[in-house]
Interface confidence: low
C-alpha cells in the first residue's frame, strides 16, 4: 500500500450525553490523517480536530452555540505527508444531529431525601451541562425547561411493587406509609422526544426509619 492511499471514514456515530458531544468513526488510520468539519448546514464548514490520527473528535464547543440547530459533520481523509491543495479530499458525512433532540440524558443523581411521617421528599441534583452562556455552565433544566421531567420509581423496602411519580421540577413530595422504609430511584425523561426519551435510572437509595441520624455520602446530605 502506498503512502498516498487513504481510506474513507465509515461508521460515523454521534456519542452525546448532556450535550457533551463526540463524533466517532472508523478505521484507525495508517499513513494518513483525518480532519473533522462541522456545520449547522451543508456549507460554511468549521474545521475541528485538524489532521488527527484519532478516530474521535469532541465537537461540544460547536454544537453548544445553538442546541436547537441541526448539525452535520464530515470526516476528511488526507495522506499523512499531505500539502494543502485545492483538490477536495475524500470524505464521509455524518448523520444529522440535533443536540436538543438527540443528546442522551445522563444518569441522574439523587441529591437528598427525607421521610417525615407520611411524606417522602426527594431532590434530584441539578445536572450541569457543557452548554455555556456568559462563562456559566447551564443546568439541564436551564436548557430543557419544562420539557424535562423526572420520574420517581419507589416501593416499600419490604415489597417489590413499584409505584411511579412524575415532576417537571427537580423535586418530589409523595405520600408514603408512616414508619415504612422505602427504596427509590429517579430517571430523567423528555416526553416530547420520539427517541432518546429516557436517561438511565439513578442509583437506588433507601430510607431507614429506625435510624434518626443523618447519613452523608460524598458531599450530599441524605436525611432519613
Amino acid at each position: 500500500t502506498g503512502t498516498t492511499d487513504v481510506i474513507v471514514a465509515y461508521n460515523l456515530t454521534w456519542k452525546s450525553t448532556n450535550f457533551k458531544t463526540i463524533l466517532e468513526w472508523e478505521p484507525k488510520p495508517i499513513n494518513y490523517v483525518y480532519t473533522v468539519q462541522i456545520s449547522p448546514r451543508l456549507g460554511d464548514w468549521k474545521n475541528k480536530c485538524f489532521h488527527t490520527t484519532d478516530t474521535e473528535c469532541d465537537v461540544t464547543d460547536e454544537i453548544m452555540r445553538n442546541v436547537k440547530e441541526t448539525y452535520v459533520a464530515r470526516v476528511l481523509s488526507y495522506p499523512a505527508d499531505t500539502v494543502l491543495t485545492a483538490q477536495e479530499p475524500p470524505f464521509t458525512n455524518s448523520p444529522p444531529f440535533t443536540p436538543y433532540l438527540d443528546t442522551n440524558l445522563g444518569q441522574p443523581v439523587i441529591q437528598s431525601f427525607e421521610q417525615v411521617g407520611t411524606k417522602l421528599n426527594v431532590t434530584v441534583e441539578a445536572a450541569r451541562t457543557l452548554v455555556r452562556v456568559n462563562g456559566t455552565f447551564l443546568r439541564l433544566r436551564d436548557v430543557f425547561g419544562k420539557d424535562l421531567n423526572y420520574t420517581l420509581y419507589y416501593w416499600r423496602a419490604s415489597s417489590t411493587g413499584k409505584k411511579k411519580a412524575t415532576t417537571n421540577t427537580n423535586e418530589f413530595l409523595i405520600d408514603v406509609d408512616k414508619g415504612e422504609n422505602y427504596c427509590f430511584s429517579v430517571q430523567a425523561v423528555i416526553p416530547s422526544r420520539r427517541v432518546n426519551q429516557k436517561s438511565p435510572e439513578s442509583r437506588i437509595e433507601c430510607t431507614s426509619q429506625e435510624k434518626a441520624v443523618s447519613r452523608e455520602t460524598g458531599h450530599h446530605h441524605h436525611h432519613h
Epitope: S39, K46, E69, L138, D142, V143
Partner: antibody
Amino acid sequence: QVQLQQWGAGLLKPSETLSLTCAVYGGSLSGYYWSWIRQPPGKGLEWIGEIGASGSTRYNPSLKSRVTISVDTSKNQFSLKLSSVTAADTAVYYCARDTPYYYEGGYYYYMDVWGKGTTVTVSS
Amino acid sequence: EIVLTQSPGTLSLSPGERATLSCRASDSVDSSYLAWYQQKPGQAPRLLIYGAFSRANGIPDRFSGSGSGTDFTLTISRLEPEDFAVYYCQQAGVVPYTFGGGTKVEIK
C-alpha cells in the same frame, strides 16, 4: 465586532416584489437567528420574521403568505423577499441578529446587532 | 398575538431627572422574553435591556429594567442629554414577536 450591511431596491411599484439582502461581517451565521424588522414612517417597529443558519424560519402570521426569508451560508448573508407590495409596505427595513439566550424554562433570543436600515418606498 | 402597550406616549423631562417608562402586555410574558431598545432619529434601534432586567454590553448602569407578568418598567435614574430618544419594549417569546408602540423621552 459583528456588523450587518444591508442593501436592496428602494423604490417599488405596487404588486412588485421587495428584495433585500443583509451581509454579516466579522462573524458567522452559525449559532444565531437572523431577523427582518420594518418601521413605517413615523410609526413603531414590526417584526417580519427570522431564519436560522440551518434554514429554519419563523414568520409573522400577518405577512406569512407574502414573505420568504432565505440564507446563503457560502456568502454569509440572508435575504428578505416580500411579494405583491402595496403602499402599506412603505417603511425602513432593518436586518438584525437574534442572539441565543438560555434561561430556566426555555431558549429564546434578543436582537443585539442591527443593520443601518434600508428605506423602501412603494408608489405608482 | 401579544400586544404591548407603552405609556406614556411622550415623557417631557429635564436632564438629571428620573424617567420611568411602562410596558404592559395583553397576556403574561415570562420576564426572560422581554427586551428594551433605544432608537434615535435616523438610526437603528439599540439593545438596552434583555431578560427584563439584564443590561446589554456597554449600556450604562443608569438604565435598569424590572417587572414581571404583564407589567414591565424601564427606569433611567438620571437622564443624560444623549438619552433623549424613543424607547421600545419587545417580547421575543411568542410568534409573532411584538414591539410596543414606543415612548418618546423629550427635553422639557
